[in-house]
Every structure is written in structure tokens, then in C-alpha cells.
Amino acid sequence: EPPTACREKQYLINSQCCSLCQPGQKLVSDCTEFTETECLPCSESEFLDTWNRETRCHQHKYCDPNLGLQVQQKGTSETDTICTCEEGLHCTSESCESCVPHRSCLPGFGVKQIATGVSDTICEPCPVGFFSNVSSAFEKCRPWTSCETKDLVVQQAGTNKTDVVCGPQDRQR
């Protein structure tokens, strides 16, 4: 009786272990006792990324500029096209099928990690001693002004949204 399982990179058909087509090629006809599997290369706009017995290659992904997408890496016969988002936008999912604008960090929050084409802005609350008074996708929390180094005193305490206000020291007469 024929084997129930074939080797890696093979498949069983008509009691024959046939070689799978290699990445970048599609199946034209199964093997026989006398002939190996017949495979053909995918066309320029198509790919197959595994050893396979597919009779059709997959179309490369289209990076639709109307959705804010652009080509990060052109597809080959063995790999799909990789899309990324235009500047100021990031992907909505891992497969990057559409883009949305980067979010800004509100006052009281600073940018921990600037957004990329595939990840959104990461914000963090400004800790004590730091503030952010703007809504921004780039600015980190800034340290409060050091009044002492300017020979001034704190007239108004800072918050996570405002800097300290410095003023002159009271002089005793």
C-alpha cells in the first residue's frame, strides 16, 4: 500500500508523493510516476510565499493612496507588497489596509513614543516637575523652569499643564 504521509515539501495524490511547487511558482499539473510536478512562475503582479499546490498565484496587495497608503516594499514572486501610511498617518491594523491620523497628546501629557507608519503616538502623563501646555504629536513633557538658577523665586507653582511662574526675591530693607 502507498505511504499515508509524504516527505516535507511533498503531497500525496494518486498514490504518488509529488513535490510541492516552490515559493513563487504555481501548480500546472500533478506528478506521475514518470514526471515531476509541473510548476510555472507567478506573473509580475502575483506571488506565492510557501511551498504549495495552488493553481493560481495571489495578487499583490494594492496600496491605495486614497486610503493614505503607500508602498513600503514592492512585492516579488515570493512575497506580497508591504504597505505603509503616508506621513502623519498610521495603520489601523497589522495588515495595514487603511490609515488614520496620528493622535496628539493633550495638555498635561507628553509624547512617550512618536508615531510611525504602523504605530500610533504613545502619550504619558507629565510627572511632577514636568508639564505640557500644548496638544502635540511630537512634544515631550518639558521640565519646569528652575527659578533658583536665575536668582528668582517661585511665585506660582507649576502643574502638569503649566510651567512655574518665577519672580524677583523680596529684598529686606
Epitope: P3, C6, R7, Q22, F34, T35, E36
Partner: antibody, heavy 123, light 107 residues
Framework: EVQLVESGGGLVQPGRSLRLSCAAS????????MHWVRQAPGKGLEWVSG????????HYADSVKGRFTISRDNAKNSLYLQMNSLRAEDTAVYYC????????????????WGRGTLVTVSS | DIQMTQSPSSVSASVGDRVTITCRAS??????LAWYQQKPGKAPKLLIY???YLESGVPSRFSGSGSGTDFTLTISSLQPEDFATYYC?????????FGGGTKVEIK
């Protein structure tokens, strides 16, 4: 250790017979098709015969068809080549070779070879 | 039978050189081509199968390419142990056939 060891070669007169053996070890012998490939002195490689894992697919090169018989004994992890009506042009090193596939003796490539045994046909 | 034609039949090269050997099939064989290395007095050793896939344990300086009828074996930087004879072999259809071999010699 994964290996193939051929034996049975030697000097033989034209028209006489010889039986080559190949002992396999280190892998599951009955999972694979096996082949004999020969190389005349100073020449290239020539496929001689192949046999599937179950012996139901057996094939020969035209140059040896009707004179040579390939067989295997899976219980003994052994491959054989019975060579009858030997001719001077059969003089060669005979290699036993393992095929990564299982189901046909008609085609394949060879991922493990023995060291070969020399057959000299001369009067 | 499918005829396999290798060229050149011999090549002289130095350690560190890039060496390219070509193999042409008389009929389309998809990517069903293997390459072997043989040193004097030794058995052939499988280097590449399915035209471009490196056999386990074979150094990455060896590479194969091609599909259809034209194939290439490249040694990117020749090492002293690479001086040998190289054979291509089609396993697309019965019977398996080999190229005539290419001897890589020391210049």
C-alpha cells in the same frame, strides 16, 4: 551514522554476472526510494536504475534494461543490483544513492551516496 | 531523454574568486534541478535541490538560480576545499539525467 556501503564489485569477464549489495544504516530505509548510479573511469555520472520504497515502481536506463535487476530487502535494510551479460562498457564505479521521495523509481535526486564499488569487465 | 549541457567543462580560478557554472536543459524542467560536488575518488555530494535550495550543512557561499531550461550554480568566494567537479541533474522526468560536469581547478 547515516550511511550507505556498497559491496560486491570486482573483475569479471564479459558475459558473466555480478551481484552488488548496498547496506543502509542510520535512517528508516523503507521510507525512501533507492537508486544505482554509475561512473565510468574519468567520465560523468549515469543513472542506472531506481526502485520505490515498496518495490512496486522499478525502472532502468535503456543501456542496462533486460540485463540488470534491482531489488531491495527492507527487513535487511539492503539494496541489490543483479548484473547479467556484463559488457566492457559496464565498467564503472557503482554508487548506491538515496532519494528523498518514496513512491517512484523512475525519477528523483540523490541526497545520500555510498562510496561506490568498482566493477571492471575485461577478458 | 532530457539532455543536460554544462558549461564551461573546466574553469581555472583562485581562492576568493566568484565562480559561475551554467546548466541548460533540452526541455523545460520547471525548477527540478539538483547540483552535486564530487572530489577525486569520492562520492558525489548534494549541494542544491529544486534549483535554488541549499541542502542542510552546505556553506552559504554556494547558491543556485534559474527556472525552465537555464540554471546557474554560483560559488561567491572560492575556498580551497571547493576545487572539485560539479554536476547538474534534472529530476523532472524519466530517466534522471546529469550534465557532463564542470571541473573547477586551481589557477
Amino acid at each position: 551514522e547515516v550511511q550507505l556501503v556498497e559491496s560486491g564489485g570486482g573483475l569479471v569477464q564479459p558475459g558473466r554476472s555480478l551481484r552488488l549489495s548496498c547496506a543502509a544504516s542510520g535512517f528508516t530505509f523503507d521510507d525512501y526510494a533507492m537508486h544505482w548510479v554509475r561512473q565510468a573511469p574519468g567520465k560523468g555520472l549515469e543513472w542506472v536504475s531506481g526502485i520505490s520504497w515498496s518495490s512496486d515502481s522499478i525502472h532502468y536506463a535503456d543501456s542496462v534494461k533486460g540485463r540488470f535487476t534491482i531489488s531491495r530487502d527492507n527487513a535487511k535494510n539492503s539494496l541489490y543490483l543483479q548484473m547479467n551479460s556484463l559488457r566492457a562498457e559496464d565498467t564503472a564505479v557503482y554508487y548506491c544513492a538515496k532519494d528523498p521521495t518514496a513512491t517512484t523509481g523512475a525519477r528523483g535526486y540523490f541526497d545520500l551516496w555510498g562510496r561506490g564499488t568498482l566493477v571492471t569487465v575485461s577478458s | 531523454d532530457i539532455q543536460m549541457t554544462q558549461s564551461p567543462s573546466s574553469v581555472s580560478a583562485s581562492v576568493g574568486d566568484r565562480v559561475t557554472i551554467t546548466c541548460r536543459a533540452s526541455k523545460v524542467i520547471s525548477s527540478w534541478l539538483a547540483w552535486y560536488q564530487q572530489k577525486p575518488g569520492k562520492a558525489p555530494k548534494l549541494l542544491i535541490y529544486a534549483a535554488s535550495y541549499l541542502e542542510s550543512g552546505v556553506p552559504s557561499r554556494f547558491s543556485g538560480s534559474g527556472s525552465g531550461t537555464d540554471f546557474t550554480l554560483t560559488i561567491s568566494s572560492l575556498q580551497p576545499e571547493d576545487f572539485a567537479t560539479y554536476y547538474c541533474q534534472q529530476h523532472s522526468s524519466f530517466p534522471p539525467t546529469f550534465g557532463g560536469g564542470t571541473k573547477v581547478e586551481i589557477k
